[in-house]
Amino acid sequence: HTAAQDNCTCPTNKMTVCSPDGPGGRCQCRALGSGMAVDCSTLTSKCLLLKARMSAPKNARTLVRPSEHALVDNDGLYDPDCDPEGRFKARQCNQTSVCWCVNSVGVRRTDKGDLSLRCDELVRTHHILIDLRHRPTAGAFNHSDLDAELRRLFRERYRLHPKFVAAVHYEQPTIQIELRQNTSQKAAGDVDIGDAAYYFERDIKGESLFQGRGGLDLRVRGEPLQVERTLIYYLDEIPPKFSMKRLTA
C-alpha cells in the first residue's frame, strides 16, 4: 500500500467528484450534474455522461451537430433524465414541455410531442454501426491488422466483451465497426454497446472521458490512424415511429 494508491479519482470518468468517505475510507465518486454514485471500474452510462456534460460551464460546451443522415443522432446535446440505474428514461422533455421518446442510447425515436406523449418502454439499441473515414495515408491499412487493432481497443480501453464487436469492415478510406448486443446477450456487468460507442466517439473527437489518460492514439502496425469524420447509426430492437412527413423530408 503506497502513497500512489492514495489518490481518490475515477479512472473511467473525469466528470466526477470523488472523496474517500465511503465505508472504510472507500473512494466514492459521483457524477457531475446528477450527483449519482458511479462505478469507476467500468464505463459510466451515456445518460449520466450527457447530464454531466450539460452541467459543465457553458464556455466548455461544444454543441455536436451531426450531418443530416436519417439514422444518426441529429438532435445533438440535451440535458437528459436518467433513471436510478443511470439509464435514459424512455420519455425525455425539455424546459418548454416538448417531449419525445428515446432509445437506450438516448437518441430520439419518435416525433416530438407535448407532455401527453407516452413512451411505454425504453427500446434497446441492439446494433450500432460506427462509420469512420480516415485521413489519407501512403497506402491502405491491412484489413486484418486494422480489425485486430480495433477489436483490441474496444476490449482493452472500453472493456467491451469481444463477442459484441460483430464485424470490422474496410474499404479505404472508410472503416465500419459493427457492434451488436441483444437484451438476451447482455449479462450483468457487461459494458453496454451504447456506452462503449459514446466513449469511442468522444475519444475520436479528442474529448476523452478517461481521467488523466492520454488521448486516443490509434495505430495500426505503427502507422497512425487519424479519423477525419465519424457517423454513428443506431438500430433499435423495435423500429422507430416517425411520421411520414419526417421520412420524406
Epitope: P20, P23, G24, R26
Partner: antibody, heavy 116, light 107 residues
Framework: QVQLQQSGPEVVKPGASVKMSCRAS????????INWVKQRTGQGLEWIGQ????????HYNKNFKGKATLTADKSSNTAYMQLNSLTSEDSAVYFC?????????WGQGTLVTVSA | DIKMTQSPSSMYAFLGERVTITCKAS??????LSWFQLKPGKSPKSLIY???RLVDGVPSRFSGSGSGQDYSLTISSLDYEDMGIYYC?????????FGGGTKLELK
Amino acid sequence: QVQLQQSGPEVVKPGASVKMSCRASGYRFTDYVINWVKQRTGQGLEWIGQIYPGSDSFHYNKNFKGKATLTADKSSNTAYMQLNSLTSEDSAVYFCARFFEGFAYWGQGTLVTVSA
Amino acid sequence: DIKMTQSPSSMYAFLGERVTITCKASQGINNYLSWFQLKPGKSPKSLIYRANRLVDGVPSRFSGSGSGQDYSLTISSLDYEDMGIYYCLQYDEFPLTFGGGTKLELK
C-alpha cells in the same frame, strides 16, 4: 510516516462523560477518514463510527447513536470521540484508525474504565 | 447489517504449518474485506485489504482470497510472531462489521 497518537487512559464514574483524542501526523488530515473501534476485554472488535474531516461528514453504528459523538478539529489535526452516560458496558479500549480503501493505520488505543 | 461469521473461533497450529481462517458474509460484499491481526496490549495491524491485496511490509506468507460472500486468510508457513487474534472486516456498506475473531495459538 503516518502516526495516530491517542490520549491517555481515563477512569470515570458511571453516568459521566469522557472525551478522548486522536492526533494525526504524517499526512494531510482532511484527505482520509478516521474510524473509531471498541474492544472490550475478552471480546471482539466493534465499529463505532467514521468521520471525514474533509467535509465533516460522518456515519455511526446505530448501536452507538446517542452514546458516541465524533468531531474533528482541522486546525490541530485531531479527531475526538465523546462518550456520554457511561456504564460498565463502556469500559473498553477505544482505537482510532485512519482508513483508506479498507487499509488502516491504527492508534495505540485509549483505555476507558468506568468505575464507581 | 451485514453479519460476518468467522471460523474457527480458535485454533492451534505447529510452526511451519499452513493455516487458513475463513469469513462468511451474510450477503455479497464485492471483495470489500480486510484482515487484521491483534496482539495483547498492541494496536491492530492491517494485513490484507480489498480481499487479496497485501499491505506493504506484511510478510508474503500472508495471503487473502475469496469473492462474493466467502473469504479466507492463509498463512503459508506459520511463524512464532503470527500468534494472536485475527479479525475480518467488511466495508462494503455501513455499518462496518467485524468477524468474531480467530485466536491462533501454538501447538
